[in-house]
């Protein structure tokens, strides 16, 4: 029989005490732990898992401290509850800051939000994977203990009349729940339905963490600075296991008897492609990562093809518009310092962004992999410093058009990072926001010339340049375009209004000019125009058909910087574009003419050669 250990977390420490040899506590040799909170383990792997409130991570390591890795590093606020599903090999956690209960595989893959509506500071979390239930406590306005199936369905309140409950623990053998109540300083127990409630201890100064093993409950007391144990039914036969321990956050017993049983997920992941989630009684459902949808086979998942991306200073988020109002998620992209602008290539499913702290354009897959710097911050050979401001992708030619604050030009760069050249440059020009319309061969940009801001249009090679608007503008900061509707949209951050026109500049109208404080990004998504307001920390939308008006999409999102809609790419339509096949045969810029044919063109420093395809 393997040895049983008490494991406990105490700020930068995770320590163990043998329950058999009564060893003194021994620190597990972990580096970089700052504020360990919730703890759990996977006995078959001999690994421990913990949340770190300060680092905002969930990590794991072997019991000897080796192979330490962060398994969840994004989108955590205060992950104060966490539990291992040892049968499905899933990780569950509750976050009192985001008010979400989430799940992923033990390595952090395939993350999904299970419960997010009407959650008020979810705290302690316990799993019963053999039965398919999860249990948690809430510390909000009305503290309670809730239960749901392990896929988040069938939610119910078990114990409504309770204080802020912590240390929620299941006695799997005797089918009882145990918890500490921080408001009454009681240790209580109930059956698995929250009934047959009993007080196990009522004379403790400050019980906090709690666990159960065999005939005993073990708890931490913040007042007595101790770990103690007592008989789990009578509360008698109390023993101090260890004293002089301040503020122990979580406690558990590491032993195989705490992780027994079987369910369908324990066998080949239930033949699910991503998550296998236990449900009552003894059943399972296949689950998908956030925003993915379960296919008709009920086993495999498909990635979203239509969604919204929005950026904050150091995060890029994805949002889907669906019936269940799925919550937005942070994409796991590292080293974002100051995201200024975002775009997306639906063909290669890659995200592009400008980081204005690092002064570069980067790209990555949505899962954070294949990170690559497309445009670097300086070109030493040319003694050139750049400051990318905005970008727009021509998906057909596979080019990025981007403006630069330092050089005040419009550049074109291939998606693989190779330079095409400068297409627009003028002594007085200050091009800033940009959006391309490759379907028609044009680009639109704001020109923030001193005292005379303009919105202009030019062909994608910088020719045919014309000013669309020069009056009624102060600081046009963002542009959006809908080729299907034939509309251009812009936001003016000084005038605090959003306007639109036809793509030729005709039919200019003010769409919205009330209660807009600092619009910084616009995008068109189906029949809606979405915008972000940095000052109000809000995403809003307006129905362009005029039927539904203005709607608040999401509030309290700090440091918003950009928003971009992604719609499903129709490959048939895509291939019909004359520039989609090998850039229309052009060496540099491929333009669609009014009759649907193409012409090749060149950046400013080159001229078109006699073959009318190449530049030299």
């Amino acid at each position: 029989v393997p040895e049983a250990f008490l494991l406990f977390s105490r700020r930068a420490d995770i320590r163990r005490i043998s329950l058999e040899t009564n060893n003194n506590n021994v620190a597990i040799p972990l580096t970089g732990v700052k504020e360990a909170s919730a703890l759990d383990f996977d006995v078959t792997d001999n690994r421990i898992y913990w949340t770190d409130i300060s680092l905002k991570t969930i990590s794991r390591a072997f019991m000897n401290g080796s192979a330490l890795e962060h398994v969840v590093e994004f989108g955590l606020d205060y992950p104060e509850g966490m539990a291992v599903d040892w049968l499905g090999k899933n990780l569950y956690w509750a976050d009192t800051g985001t008010n979400r209960i989430e799940v992923s595989k033990l390595d952090g893959q395939h993350r999904q939000v299970l419960v997010w509506k009407d959650l008020d500071s979810p705290r302690a979390l316990a799993l019963d994977p053999a039965e398919g239930f999860m249990y948690w406590t809430e510390w909000g306005g009305k503290p309670k203990i809730d239960r749901a199936a392990m896929d988040g369905s069938e939610r119910t309140t078990l114990v409504p009349n309770v204080g802020r409950a912590n240390g929620l623990t299941i006695d799997y053998a005797k089918r009882r729940l145990y918890w500490t109540d921080l408001d009454t300083n009681l240790i209580e127990s109930s059956n698995m339905l929250g009934l047959n409630r009993e007080v196990i201890a009522d004379d403790l100064p400050h019980p906090f963490g709690l666990t159960q093993y065999q005939d005993y409950i073990y708890w931490t007391d913040w007042s007595r600075r101790s770990i103690e144990r007592a008989n789990k039914t009578s509360g008698q036969n109390r023993t101090i296991i260890q004293g002089h321990l301040d503020y122990v956050m979580d406690i558990l017993v590491f032993h195989s008897s705490r992780q027994s049983g079987w369910n369908e997920c324990a066998s080949s992941n239930g033949h699910c492609s991503h998550l296998c989630l236990a449900v009552p009684v003894g059943g399972f459902v296949c689950g998908c990562p956030a925003h993915y949808s379960l296919n008709a086979d009920n086993r495999t998942c498909s990635a979203p093809t239509t969604f919204l991306l929005f950026s904050q200073k150091s995060a890029i988020n994805r949002m889907v518009i669906d019936e269940q109002q799925s919550p937005d998620i942070i994409l796991p992209i590292h080293s974002l310092r100051n995201v200024r602008a975002i775009d997306y290539d639906p063909l290669d499913k890659q995200l592009y962004w400008i980081d204005s702290r690092q002064n570069m354009i980067r790209k990555a897959q949505e899962d954070g992999s294949q990170g690559f710097t497309v445009v670097v911050s300086s070109v030493p050979s040319q003694n050139l410093e750049i400051q990318p401001y905005d970008l727009s992708i021509d998906i057909y030619s596979r080019y990025i058009y981007w403006t630069c604050e330092a050089t005040n030009v419009i550049n074109v760069t291939r998606l693989d990072g190779r330079s095409v050249g400068v297409v627009l440059k003028g002594e007085q020009d200050r091009p800033r926001a940009i959006v391309v319309n490759p379907e028609k061969g044009y680009m639109y940009f704001t020109n923030l010339q001193e005292r005379s801001p303009k919105i202009e249009r030019a062909a994608l090679d910088g020719t045919e340049r014309e000013v669309l608007f020069f009056s009624g503008l102060s600081k046009p900061i963002a542009l959006a375009l809908d080729s299907r509707l034939g509309k251009l949209f812009w936001a003016d951050s000084d005038l605090r209004r959003i306007e639109s026109s036809d793509l030729s500049g005709a039919n200019r109208i003010v769409l919205e000019d009330s209660n807009i404080l600092q619009p910084v990004g616009l995008t068109v998504f189906e029949n809606w125009l979405y915008w972000i307001d940095k000052q109000q920390q809000m995403i809003e939308k307006i129905d362009m058909t005029g039927r539904e008006g203005r709607t608040k999409v999401q509030a309290r999102i700090a440091q918003l910087s950009d928003i971009h809609a992604v719609k499903e790419l129709n490959l048939q339509e895509y291939r019909q574009h004359p520039c989609a096949q090998d850039n229309g045969g052009c060496s540099h810029i491929c333009l669609v003419k009014g009759d649907g044919t193409t012409r090749c063109s060149c950046p400013m420093h080159l001229v078109l050669l006699q073959d009318e395809l190449s530049c030299g």
Epitope: R11, A12, K34, E35, Y247
Partner: antibody, heavy 121, light 107 residues
Framework: EVQLVESGGGLVQPGGSLRLSCAAS????????IHWVRQAPGKGLEWVAS????????DYADSVKGRFTISADTSKNTAYLQMNSLRAEDTAVYYC??????????????WGQGTLVTVSS | DIQMTQSPSSLSASVGDRVTITCRAS??????VAWYQQKPGKAPKLLIY???FLYSGVPSRFSGSGSGTDFTLTISSLQPEDFATYYC?????????FGQGTKVEIK
């Protein structure tokens, strides 16, 4: 028994220096943030600086940044506040306090008795 | 920096009275607020942490509530030893900041 004992206060001229000590006992020193908080005569509490001895992380109030330095000697379970370029407005009782971090959401659960620093010519 | 504004700055009350002191943060501080009691010539003592949790050994007549920007310290039945100055403090962001204090005096 948890104890925090400050020492090193006294009278010093403007522009002068002083080093305060905070000797900690009765708890695991490296598991706590150690703060210096001051209170000018008849006034409220003002946070000055903090250190997390385990990691060496430090923070300072803008009013003392560049003049004061907080440090800790984990072998002696002692935190220090080196105060240079002292000004009349630095006159206060200086308290040393500890915080267990997230456990109490940053609250300071034990305070020393304080040491008086008077900056005057 | 986050400002913590306490009110009132002073109040007079009698033994047995219910006393309420409020603290308003200049921006959202979640529940990262503590309350301290200080008597003349003494160091502050922690009463409430995380907005509403009673610190060990503190009498249950003290309670705290609130979240976001508005917080309250309540003494349900004022006792002679409760006459002191009370401070709120936020620890949501660095630097931690204190309210200016509320002096509770005998009427």
């Amino acid at each position: 028994e948890v104890q925090l004992v400050e020492s090193g206060g006294g009278l010093v001229q403007p522009g002068g220096s002083l080093r305060l000590s905070c000797a900690a006992s009765g708890f695991t020193f490296t598991n706590y943030d150690i703060h210096w908080v001051r209170q000018a005569p008849g006034k409220g509490l003002e946070w000055v600086a903090s250190i997390y001895p385990a990691g060496g992380d430090t923070d300072y109030a803008d009013s003392v940044k560049g003049r004061f330095t907080i440090s800790a000697d984990t072998s002696k379970n002692t935190a220090y506040l080196q105060m240079n370029s002292l000004r009349a407005e630095d006159t206060a009782v200086y308290y040393c306090a500890r915080s267990p971090g997230w456990a109490l959401r940053g609250a300071m659960d034990y305070w020393g008795q304080g040491t008086l620093v008077t900056v005057s010519s | 920096d986050i400002q913590m504004t306490q009110s009132p700055s002073s109040l007079s009350a009698s033994v047995g009275d219910r006393v309420t002191i409020t603290c308003r943060a200049s921006q959202d501080v979640s529940t990262a607020v503590a309350w301290y009691q200080q008597k003349p010539g003494k160091a502050p003592k922690l009463l409430i942490y995380s907005a509403s949790f009673l610190y060990s050994g503190v009498p249950s007549r003290f309670s705290g509530s609130g979240s976001g920007t508005d917080f309250t310290l309540t003494i349900s039945s004022l006792q002679p030893e409760d006459f002191a100055t009370y401070y709120c403090q936020q620890s949501y962001t660095t630097p931690p900041t204190f309210g200016q204090g509320t002096k509770v005096e005998i009427k």
